[in-house]
């Protein structure tokens, strides 16, 4: 079957990193500099992505794979494959269209990205406030007020290892 297919389409024999060159009787030619083909049988090579300006190179382009970019310090990636870099703000701030602004009282942001969010209202979940919120941290909810008998002690849980937004991209 492979033999039949290659007789029908000689380009199917061209591996990744090459292209089927119509100008040279459909022989497999290596991708030119700054281009790549990630699959076999391609009739053209794709231009390598260039990480310029606020983008920096995370992985160099090769003949078989595109370059990968991330963002320079002070910026973070957004979009598939880090298609955009957005300015970081400090924890306790949010990025508005006018720049970084402090979170209003009653809201927090524990990330360098995203919005200021309202503190959790523990009472709505039948719980009490164990640790008050700040601009950088949500409140910590504890047991329901009825569960807290006199003399009972509460322990503040350790800070989470990773909050939303810190996942690998």
């Amino acid at each position: 079957f492979e033999r039949t297919r290659s007789l029908q389409d000689p380009c199917s024999n061209c591996p990744a990193g090459t292209f089927c060159d119509n100008n040279r009787n459909q022989i497999c030619s290596p991708c030119p500099p700054n281009s790549f083909s990630s699959a076999g049988g391609q009739r053209t090579c794709d231009i390598c992505r260039q990480c310029k300006g606020v983008f920096r190179t995370r992985k160099e382009c090769s003949s078989t794979s595109n370059a990968e970019c991330d963002c320079t310090p002070g910026f973070h990636c957004l979009g598939a494959g880090c298609s955009m870099c957005e300015q970081d703000c400090k924890q306790g701030q949010e990025l508005t269209k006018k720049g970084c602004k402090d979170c209003c009282f009653g809201t927090f942001n524990d990330q360098k990205r995203g919005i200021c969010r309202p503190w959790t209202n523990c009472s709505l979940d039948g719980k009490s406030v164990l640790v008050n919120g700040t601009k950088e941290r949500d409140v910590v909810c504890g047991p329901s007020p009825a569960d807290l008998s006199p003399g009972a002690s509460s322990v503040t849980p350790p800070a989470p290892a990773r909050e939303p937004g810190h996942s690998p991209q």
């Epitope: 990330q111 919005i115 309202p118 990773r162 909050e163 937004g165 991209q169």
Partner: antibody, heavy 120, light 106 residues
Framework: QMQLVQSGAEVKKPGASVKVSCKAS????????MHWVRQAPGQGLEWMGW????????NYAQKFQGRVTITRDTSASTAYMELSSLRSEDTAVYYC?????????????WGQGTLVTVSS | SYELTQPPSVSVAPGKTARITCGGN??????VHWYQQKPGQAPVLVIY???DRPSGIPERFSGSNSGNTATLTISRVEAGDEADYYC?????????FGGGTQLTVL
């Protein structure tokens, strides 16, 4: 392949409660806020609230405060939405939706929806 | 509470450009997201952050936002674009959706 798979359709009587589940796979469950949105038959989208899967912190739409509870089980990569004191107007498709990496309330992946019918 | 106003319906011929508006007080200061929903299916994010496109969404979809109006533009409209479209913003601790616009491809 990233997926949000919700529990099956429910039929409830007025005054009862319903608990809908949303199981996440194909990504780090703890790393993204989870929202619940509902849609009554022939109507638009209505936001109910969110949970931070890492901390369990929540925020609810004012309309549902006191009636809705959103929780999560990180070990099962599952979020839950419980709505109590059901009335006929709560008949709707209930969706869970993941907030995207920008963390600006963009809901980039949705469950298939769970139809909850409230009828006596 | 904050309100978003969308036209209930918009009709457009195949190959033409459809514009769906979303009105709100000083909406230009907010980030607007747009969703497409086809009958019997869950919504799909088509534009976020006013004008950014998620991967897999055709370049025919674009967005803009200034003043009191955000706009979703679909160029070279195809039959498969027929759906309901919703705008969404964040305002004072609540996620707000527009009422939705039914796009009909003639």
């Amino acid at each position: 392949q990233m997926q949000l798979v919700q529990s099956g359709a429910e039929v409830k009587k007025p005054g009862a409660s319903v608990k809908v589940s949303c199981k996440a796979s194909g990504y780090s469950f703890s790393g993204y806020y989870m929202h619940w949105v509902r849609q009554a038959p022939g109507q638009g989208l209505e936001w109910m609230g969110w949970v931070n899967p890492m901390s369990g912190g929540t925020n609810y739409a004012q309309k549902f405060q006191g009636r809705v509870t959103i929780t999560r089980d990180t070990s099962a990569s599952t979020a839950y939405m419980e709505l109590s004191s059901l009335r006929s107007e709560d008949t709707a498709v209930y969706y869970c939706a993941r907030e995207g990496m920008a963390m600006r309330l963009e809901l980039d992946k949705w469950g298939q929806g769970t139809l909850v019918t409230v009828s006596s | 509470s904050y309100e978003l106003t969308q036209p209930p319906s918009v009709s457009v011929a195949p190959g033409k450009t459809a514009r769906i508006t979303c009105g709100g007080n000083n909406i230009g200061s907010k980030s607007v997201h747009w969703y497409q929903q086809k009958p019997g299916q869950a919504p799909v994010l088509v534009i976020y952050y006013d004008s950014d496109r998620p991967s897999g969404i055709p370049e025919r979809f674009s967005g803009s936002n200034s003043g009191n109006t955000a706009t979703l533009t679909i160029s070279r409209v195809e039959a498969g674009d027929e759906a309901d479209y919703y705008c969404q913003v964040w305002d004072s601790s609540s996620v707000v959706f527009g009422g939705g616009t039914q796009l009909t491809v003639l």
